[in-house]
């Protein structure tokens, strides 16, 4: 039981893409405020988003400290203007989040095709290595830095004149594919982490086609 007129948060949900991680919950506060705490399974609780009227809290700074850890958060409810007030058990009302392991669960953001270059009947397609908010030695790591070979990309490519999508895979950020001479091709990529059980695929990149300015053509 909690303080009179204070409602416990519910529907605690992790929203995370490329490790940018926000905890969301309900309800919109009426005469109450929230504080969030986060901890690893074995760690101490750290408070964030003190006495907020928002129903979300950005926990990125905490989870990027170790993306392979499993985190738990909880949302405390306090009466507005009386945040020292506690429930009958001597503690404010709170609700726990589901556990969250960023490395296994963060959504893969939509990739971007950085460039493609044709040399004769070969095309080299390069995927942008997106920067994350995960740091090592004061440097922001890229998605590839974090996931290494766990992250692969699937390239879908097709002749502009047809609809059938051929596929290629890479565990780097580059593809080298064979194409027919004199044909224009279109490309789309998808990030995949095959070892995962959830959130295995990203949405597809925007389609890029030969004959547009991202590409370069060299006849050899």
């Amino acid at each position: 039981s909690g303080t009179t007129n204070t409602v416990a948060a519910y529907n605690l949900t992790w929203k995370s893409t490329n490790f940018k991680t926000i905890l969301e919950w309900e309800p919109k506060p009426v005469n109450q405020v929230y504080t969030v705490q986060i901890s690893t399974k074995s760690g101490d609780w750290k408070s964030k988003c003190f006495y907020t009227t928002d129903t979300e809290c950005d926990l990125t700074d905490e989870i990027v400290k170790d993306v392979k850890q499993t985190y738990l958060a909880r949302v405390f409810s306090y009466p507005a203007g009386n945040v020292e007030s506690t429930g009958s058990a001597g503690e404010p009302l709170y609700e726990n989040s589901p556990e969250f392991t960023p490395y296994l669960e963060t959504n893969l953001g939509q990739p971007t095709i950085q460039s493609f270059e044709q040399v004769g009947t070969k095309v080299n397609v390069t995927v942008e290595d997106e920067r994350t908010l995960v740091r090592r030695n004061n440097t922001f790591l890229s998605l590839r830095d974090v996931f290494g070979k766990d992250l692969i990309y699937t390239l879908y490519y097709w002749k502009s004149s047809s609809s059938g999508k051929k596929t290629a895979k890479t565990n780097t950020n580059e593809f080298l594919i064979d194409v027919d001479k004199g044909e224009n091709y279109c490309f789309s990529v998808q990030a995949v982490i095959p070892s995962r059980t959830v959130n295995r695929k990203s949405t597809d990149s925007p389609v890029e086609c030969m004959g547009q300015e991202k590409g370069e053509f060299r006849e050899i």
Epitope: K149, I152, Y156, S163, G164, K165, K166, T167, A168, K169, T170, N171, D178, S188, Q190, V192, P194, V198, R200, K201, D204
Partner: antibody
């Protein structure tokens, strides 16, 4: 438990149509890739086509291009093979299979039990 | 399309024999080769993936190897339940292609 169950096979006249279903359970199809493979009586395995159910992308074997269409309905967790303008040489057992990756190498770890399509007048 | 030439097309062997089946790719396919076992009236079953990785639940008497564009499936000691047809398959490029199959029969 992961399972793929095909249905919809049967006897059809040349030039006719048939729609095969591949109902998946134990996993969600948009997280994987679904292939269709066929096997004529007494013959080897022949790849028919694939779909990525997350985006609808498909590719077909030359032997069925323009006649067969693969689709998927994520809400039903089911993939389909629509077969039009059927010919006697399309007579076969049709299998759907789930594809996954080990690194960049694909493998097909779960297969349906197969459904027999007979094209004959 | 990449051709997978499988040999032999059939072989006769006895229980306990060492059996080797080979597949040659018409061009480089890296390690993107899988091997399947099929029994009459049944769907194929995955045995080996990525040329040499044993699929979960498959007995350790099965193994796969690669040398350039040549791929080998070996059954170290043939068991009664191993009499079946075996197929290699490449997934390196679209379309994926199968070998013609090797029927392993009882001598």
């Amino acid at each position: 438990e992961v399972q793929l169950v095909e249905s919809g096979g049967g006897l059809v006249q040349p030039g006719g149509s048939l729609r095969l279903s591949c109902a998946a359970s134990g996993f969600t199809i948009p997280a994987y890739w679904i292939h269709w493979v066929r096997q004529a009586p007494g013959k080897g395995l022949e790849w028919v086509g694939y779909i990525d159910p997350s985006n609808g992308y498909t590719y077909y074997a030359d032997s069925v291009k323009g006649r067969f269409t693969i689709s998927a309905d994520a809400s039903k967790n089911t993939a389909y093979l629509q077969m039009n303008s059927l010919r006697a040489e399309d007579t076969a057992a049709y299998y759907c299979a789930r594809a996954d990756y080990h690194g960049v190498d694909e493998y097909w770890d779960y297969w349906g039990q197969g459904t027999l399509v007979t094209v004959s007048s | 399309d990449i051709q997978m030439t499988q040999s032999p097309s059939s072989l006769s062997a006895s229980v306990g024999d060492r059996v080797t089946i080979t597949c040659r790719a018409s061009q480089d396919v890296n390690t993107a080769v899988a091997w399947y076992q099929q029994k009459p009236g049944k769907a194929p079953k995955l045995l080996i993936y990525s040329a040499s990785f044993l699929y979960s639940g498959v007995p350790s008497r099965f193994s796969g190897s690669r040398s350039g564009t040549d791929f080998t499936l070996t059954i170290s000691s043939l068991q009664p339940e191993d009499f079946a047809t075996y197929y290699c398959q490449q997934h390196y490029t679209t379309p994926p292609t199968f070998g013609q199959g090797t029927k392993v029969e009882i001598k």
